[in-house]
């Protein structure tokens, strides 16, 4: 497996009750607007063929996509949570800016691309679904990167 570099987040990022609560509230609100319960974006399939030590790099890709292609286009919705959660996730993304893996990351890009394709295919409801899974994104980042 390729070696990961600088793929670490400080534990304290995930020990802030206020922003954790706001992230989960945002996910809950978006989830209640999601009528496509058959599709899961962040689940076993996302991590298939990706070793545990490569998963922070994978989650960095998912985080960046979520910020740029999901949260920004939907930034006027789900207030007041959105205006607090987006800067928090942007800080995490910035902290992972130097996270990369030495070697082939094709297997990771393939998995991330499947997630992106699913969101794009579902259109706005895909974006809502991604916001509804911010709790899973949060927990997966914590598991993968601390």
């Amino acid at each position: 497996a390729p070696v990961s570099s600088h793929c670490r987040l400080d534990k304290s990022n995930f020990q802030q009750p206020y922003i954790t609560n706001r992230t989960f509230m945002l996910a809950k609100e978006a989830s209640s607007a999601d009528n496509n319960t058959d599709v899961r974006l962040i689940g076993e399939k996302l991590f298939r063929g990706v070793s545990m030590s490569e998963r922070c790099y994978l989650m960095k890709q998912v985080l960046n996509f979520t910020l740029e292609e999901v949260l920004l286009p939907q930034s006027d919705r789900f207030q007041p949570y959105m205006q607090e959660v987006v800067p928090f996730l942007a800080r995490l993304s910035n902290s992972l800016s130097t996270c990369h893996i030495e070697g082939d990351d094709l297997h990771i890009q393939k998995n991330v691309q499947k997630l992106k394709d699913t969101v794009k295919k579902l259109g706005e409801s895909g974006e809502i679904k991604a916001i509804g899974e911010l709790d899973l994104l949060f927990m997966s980042l914590r598991n993968a990167c601390i």
Partner: antibody, heavy 120, light 107 residues
Amino acid sequence: EVQLQESGPGLVQPSQTLSPTCTVSGFSLTSYSVHWVRQHSGKSLEWMGRMWSDGDTSYNSAFTSRLSITRDTSKSQVFLKMNSLQTEDTGTYYCARSLDFYYDTTLAFWGPGTTVTVSS
Amino acid sequence: DIVMTQTPSNLAASPGESVSINCKASKTISKYLAWYQQKPGKANKLLIYSGSTLQSGTPSRFSGSGSSTDFTLTIRNLEPEDFGLYYCQQHNEYPLTFGSGTKLEIK
């Protein structure tokens, strides 16, 4: 409460097929992966393969050519099939559930195992 | 495949004592090591994963440490129910592989 229970014939003839069943309760097979692990008498554990929550499978290359894992979600059962058995395949066969979707390679819940003897 | 070398094979201790079991991976597995307890007639029990995370229900007298290739399971203030077989397992990549086991016996 999460439970797994293996069952199957205790004695199998050499060259025949081993086919234990894992019956689960307390969780859905469409939400969690189930792994098969074997243990030779008094020896270490050996990971055989996995049934993913979406029905896909992964196998240990040491077994790939003679191993097959299938499931029946309506009966909450996962099946292991291994052909061309030799006496070295004697041992205890376990099924185990992964911890969650993220820690999918961590075996959090195990069945008590089913003992298989390969002998004529 | 990653080879897990577990030492010692056998260990004898008295209740109240502390013991350590070691596990060495043939290549780096970051922090992704799990420890299991095996007792006759009982289902195998996950004690620790990710090197040091206690599984729900695991008593606090159990602790795990280490990263990269070298890991240790420590049991402090041994209780009678702690005696049995212990296995390490790397859960970083496939195929999942286990150590050869350590038999912890009452002295």
